[in-house]
């Protein structure tokens, strides 16, 4: 066990052009506070993943009012260290998030308003017991200067706070198998202390605070015999007595998650999903209120009305979960219509529309004939990514505004001559052909392929196409 300590030295405009505006004004005085979130390992964890190593919130800084016309100076800081206690071993490598929050002190309805000014994150290696490490991080136009260290709480010592030390019982030497505790040579390593309540018969530990079970026993304290009545979902070695596989203890057996947390197995261990108001590796840390800054990603915290709703996070768009810790896959709701491609930009959703569609959600069909006039008696036809007009005879073009040459397509077959006419075209057929397009040969016996020529027309006369 031990404590991670963070000392904020300054928060103000970074070097270079574009100095940020002061977050406070005479009309809206404000004060700063800081939140730190620690996670084990060097993995690139998302900002919304839980602070598995712990989190802490600073006190509020002095009230600050901007001097009119003055550039934003380094802002007045809260007193004291931010301290994040850790119960288990210090991991040596860790990720951190430090958030700078502004508390506005104007006459807001419902008390002070909070807003996130800057967030910095990083991954570091750090041995417990070492000196203060100094750091500078930039977030936009702001610069944060800070120092940090990890120190062990007695009786733990070592770079991971896993060795335990006790005062020597005898002045000359330590007990059998126990070494002196460097640098505290007057103390001796203590035997490992397993998790409180760990069964002395069926449990053992290799790290302090641990409780690992011998085969055939399970539960957080190794007090629950493994059932041999069922051979389903084997996990352990074969049992000679039952002839089937006895499940060895799984990480979630006996549910290590306290306070109603639900356990899920991970490749290396287990993960607890904690109910509102609890956090920590095993949901063992309780009594969280808004003062602890439990809302991630700029969520607004309001006090709940009972212990099971100790605080309520009102999440900004794009986040959900009781702590606003989960990023919403807003594209999973398929907001883009008509086959548009959804892009979640974090701060906003964007739809990339297919050809022929437009609008924030691709809801407007550009083929839509509404408001599209086809001239000269043409009719609008939807489709193909652009509206199309089916034009009346004698007209063409996209909107039927162009007068068409009906003879341009050479509609008269078999060498017939085409004449443009006010209501269409007329074909004058070559000898031996007849029909509106001169498409029918006249038979040598004088009968035509048509049953009869229309009254008043002799075969070979120009046929008017109506």
């Amino acid at each position: 066990a031990g404590v991670f300590e963070l000392q904020i030295h300054s928060f103000g405009p970074g070097p270079g052009p574009g100095a940020p505006r002061s977050p406070c004004s005479a009309r809206l005085p404000c004060r700063l506070f800081f939140r730190v979130c620690l996670k084990p390992g060097l993995s690139e964890e998302a900002a919304e993943s839980p602070c598995a190593l712990g989190a802490a919130l600073s006190a509020r800084g002095p009230v600050y009012t901007e001097q009119p016309g003055a550039p934003a100076p380094d802002l007045p800081l809260p007193d004291g260290l931010l301290q994040v206690p850790f119960r288990d071993a210090w991991p040596g490598t860790f990720s951190f998030i430090i958030e700078t929050w502004r508390e506005e002190l104007g006459d807001q309805i419902g008390g002070p308003a909070w807003s996130l000014l800057a967030r910095v994150a990083g991954r570091r290696r750090l041995a417990a017991g070492g000196p203060w490490a100094r750091d500078i991080q930039r977030a936009g136009a702001w610069e944060l200067r800070f120092s940090y260290r990890a120190r062990c709480e007695p009786p733990a010592v070592g770079t991971a706070c896993t060795r335990l030390c006790r005062p020597r019982s005898a002045p000359s030497r330590c007990g059998p198998g126990l070494r002196p505790c460097a640098p505290l040579e007057d103390e001796c390593e203590a035997p490992l202390v397993c998790r409180a309540g760990c069964s002395p018969e069926h449990g053992f530990c290799e790290q302090p605070g641990e409780c690992r079970c011998l085969e055939g026993w399970t539960g957080p304290l190794c007090t629950v015999p493994v059932s041999t009545s069922s051979c389903l979902s084997p996990r352990g070695p074969s049992s000679a007595t039952t002839g089937c596989l006895v499940p060895g203890p799984g990480p979630c057996d006996g549910n290590p998650c306290a306070n109603g947390g639900s356990c899920s197995e991970t490749p290396r261990s287990f993960e607890c999903t904690c109910p509102r108001g609890f956090y920590g590796l095993r949901c063992e840390v309780s009594g969280v209120t808004c003062a602890d800054g439990p809302c991630f990603n700029g969520g607004l915290c309001v006090g709940g009305a009972d212990p099971d709703s100790a605080y309520i996070c009102h999440c900004p768009p794009g986040f959900q979960g009781s702590n606003c810790e989960k990023r919403v896959d807003r594209c999973s709701l398929q907001p883009c219509r008509n086959g548009g491609l959804c892009l979640d930009l974090g701060h906003a959703l964007r739809c990339r529309c297919r050809a022929g569609f437009a609008g924030p959600r691709c809801e407007h069909d550009l083929d839509d004939c509404a408001g599209r006039a086809c001239a000269n008696g043409g009719t609008c036809v939807e489709g193909g990514g652009a509206h199309r007009c089916s034009c009346a005879l004698g007209f063409g073009g996209r909107d039927c505004r162009e007068r068409a040459d009906p003879c341009a397509a050479r509609p008269c077959a078999h060498g017939g001559r085409c004449y443009a006419h006010f209501s269409g075209l007329v074909c004058a057929c070559a000898p031996g052909y007849m029909g509106a397009r001169c498409e029918f040969p006249v038979h040598p016996d004088g009968a035509s392929a048509l049953p009869a020529a229309p009254p008043g027309l002799r075969p070979g006369d120009p046929q008017r196409y109506l």
């Epitope: 008390g111 209120t289 003062a291 009305a305 009972d306 212990p307 099971d308």
Partner: antibody, heavy 117, light 109 residues
Amino acid sequence: EVQLVETGGGLVQPKGSLKLSCAVSAFTFTTYAMNWVRQAPGKGLEWVARIRNKSNNYHTYYADSVKDRFTISRDDSQSMLYLQMNNLKIEDTAMYYCVFYYDYVYWGQGTLVTVSA
Amino acid sequence: QAVVTQESALTTSPGETVTLTCRSSTGAVTTSNYANWIQEKPDHLFTGLIGGTNNRAPGVPARFSGSLIGDKAALTITGAQTEDEAIYFCGLWYSNHLVFGGGTKLTVL
């Protein structure tokens, strides 16, 4: 809008039993702890019982005055809250309210229980 | 068992500011008591005003505010109106048990 509708009140003799129900709508019932609160005629409010949600193992809590006589329960699938009252006493006469605490307090309209010989 | 104490009655005038308080027998009221304020009007009409010490319910006028003053929870009505005449109960949570105060009868003359 959150709605809590209590039913099941009535006239009962001392040592008798009664079961109150509360139908809940317009919020995710399964997520929250639920409570019964009562108000005797001309008196103040008295908290009676509380039942937590499934992730808190449906733990129940009771006021000393009703312990071992009243049982609070819930049916998450129906969004229903219940109060089984046994061995009723004259001092249990009151208006009974189904109450839900979240960001503030939500009340039902109440159901009257009268214990009289 | 904790006892929660409120003023039995208070009188104010329209437009005045009045503060109702809620004291715990176990010591200072803290945010961990999730102080709640409830208004009762005739015919058993209850309205939750404030939850979690200072969280005003939607639809409740801005003149109602909750806070901690010293070692007590407080409900302040800034600019009381005649329609604010009612009985006000405070409730405090002690772990999973809820204890109500006896109520304050507020008269707005």
